[in-house]
Each structure stands twice: as structure tokens, then as C-alpha cells.
């Protein structure tokens, strides 16, 4: 059995240039793998679409924080 977890590399090459309303967002994933050209966030929308966004943008960081709080509050 392998001693480390192997995950397929997902990269963002382009990021969305407009804000996504928070109520449309379901979850996010951080992309920090150095084999990717830039650090990014992949938002999953409630319709199942995945969108790359730039974590340097304020709305992206605020959305991540909002989703963190929602998921924390859902925990038993």
C-alpha cells in the first residue's frame, strides 16, 4: 500500500474575471500544487459547474471565508 496519497493534478490556467454571487456557491478547493502555473481556487456552483478564481481577489477570499463558516456551522 502506498505511503502517500496520490491525487490527479488539476490546474487553473484562466480565472473568472467577474464576481460569482455567494448564494450560487456550494464549495471550493484550493489549488496550490507547484506544477500548476498559479495558485487558484476552484468554486463549485450549486448547478455543479466548476469555476477557477484568483484568491488574490477580495471577493474570492470573502467567499472562501463565508463557505468555511457555513460548513463549520453544519457540523454536529
Amino acid at each position: 500500500q502506498p505511503d502517500s496519497v496520490s491525487i490527479p493534478i488539476t490546474c487553473c490556467f484562466n480565472v473568472i474575471n467577474r464576481k460569482i454571487p455567494i448564494q450560487r456557491l456550494e464549495s471550493y478547493t484550493r489549488i496550490t500544487n507547484i506544477q500548476c502555473p498559479k495558485e487558484a481556487v476552484i468554486f463549485k456552483t450549486k448547478r455543479g459547474k466548476e469555476v477557477c478564481a484568483d484568491p488574490k481577489e477580495r471577493w474570492v477570499r470573502d467567499s472562501m471565508k463565508h463557505l468555511d463558516q457555513i460548513f463549520q456551522n453544519l457540523k454536529p
Epitope: 484550493r30 496550490t32 507547484i34 495558485e39 484568491p55 488574490k56 471565508k65 468555511d68 463558516q69 463549520q72
Partner: antibody, heavy 117, light 107 residues
Amino acid sequence: QVQLVQSGAEVKKPGSSVKVSCKASGLTISDTYMHWVRQAPGQGLEWMGRIDPANGNTKFDPKFQGRVTITADTSTSTAYMELSSLRSEDTAVYYCARGVFGFFDYWGQGTTVTVSS
Amino acid sequence: DIQMTQSPSSLSASVGDRVTITCKATEDIYNRLAWYQQKPGKAPKLLISGATSLETGVPSRFSGSGSGTDYTLTISSLQPEDFATYYCQQFWSAPYTFGGGTKVEIK
């Protein structure tokens, strides 16, 4: 692969300033934030501040505000940290590190700064 | 500022032991917690981010858990190369702060 290579060790007098450099390869520094973290001998880690090299925006721990300057030169992929009004308590290893999200996945090798009269 | 309290500050263990290190924040940090390993004379190495996400290449014997203000790093079966100092760090809000560290020594 990513490398952050820092400048060499420094010995400084109290009251003087030190400037440490951090040259990045294998990444575009304007795509990330560059942070500075220090570690006094035998002590823990202490975040000092960070810069967004794309626009020069900085954020600092208030403890260091006014005494630390962080700059970046995207043309040479180098970040700099200057600490002024040095005192003996500033004797530490200073690290640069990268990360947009507030955690640090790549670190420099560290630069030892000794403040002694 | 958010303060991070790590315990124990040191522990002695043997190869094969299960080791648990805890970290407590002074306020909810919503899983924005990282764990690092540091060996003498070296820079810290990121093990876990987001409280539970193992970094690529980090052995699966390392795991993170917790929520709210309380978080745990577990090494399921301690290996010789795991003797080091471990730090937690919150990245919920700047200034980002670290725990005081836990030194894992050979018993």
C-alpha cells in the same frame, strides 16, 4: 522545481538595519504572496508580514509595523525584507515563504541575523 | 490576534508509537489550520493545510482532524525520520500565528 534562495548571514550592530533578499525560481512571484517568518534561537515561528508582488500591497503583524519594510522586484523574482532599529531580540533566522492562502508551502533556507555590539 | 496553544511542548516516544499533538485557538478558525514539521537547522515543511488536507508527498501516517478551536495532528506509527518539532499555524486571520511547537524526541 520551486526554489527560494536567500542572502547570506549578517552580523549587525544595535540600532542599525538589515536587508535580506529572497530570490525565487520555478514560480512567478506576482502570482503569489511572499511572506517573511522569523525564528529566534531555540524559539518558535513568528509571522512578520507579506507582500503581493503584483502591486506592492503589504500587510504586517502590528508588532513589526513601522520597523519592517517588505518590497519585491518582479523583474528579478526577488523579495526583500528590511528590519530597522535592530536590537538584540531581533537575533533570529529569517525565512521567506510563498502562499496566497495564508499557509506556506515553499520556504527559503533561512538567513541568520545576529545583532550584537 | 488569535493565540495558538500547542500541547504538549515535548514528548518522548518510540518507533511505531501513535503520537497525538493538539492545538487550541482562542477563537473559531474555521479549519484554517496548517501543520509543519521542522528539523534542526532546516526550514519548516508543510504537512497539512485546511486542518485535514495532506500535502502531496506527505506520508499517510500523518493525519489532521478537528474543528472550531480544537485541532489534532496524529502520527499513526512513528518512524525514525519523524523525530522533529511540529508547529500548528492558523491562517483564518492576519496576523497569522503559530503554536509554540511540540518537540518529538526518541524515548
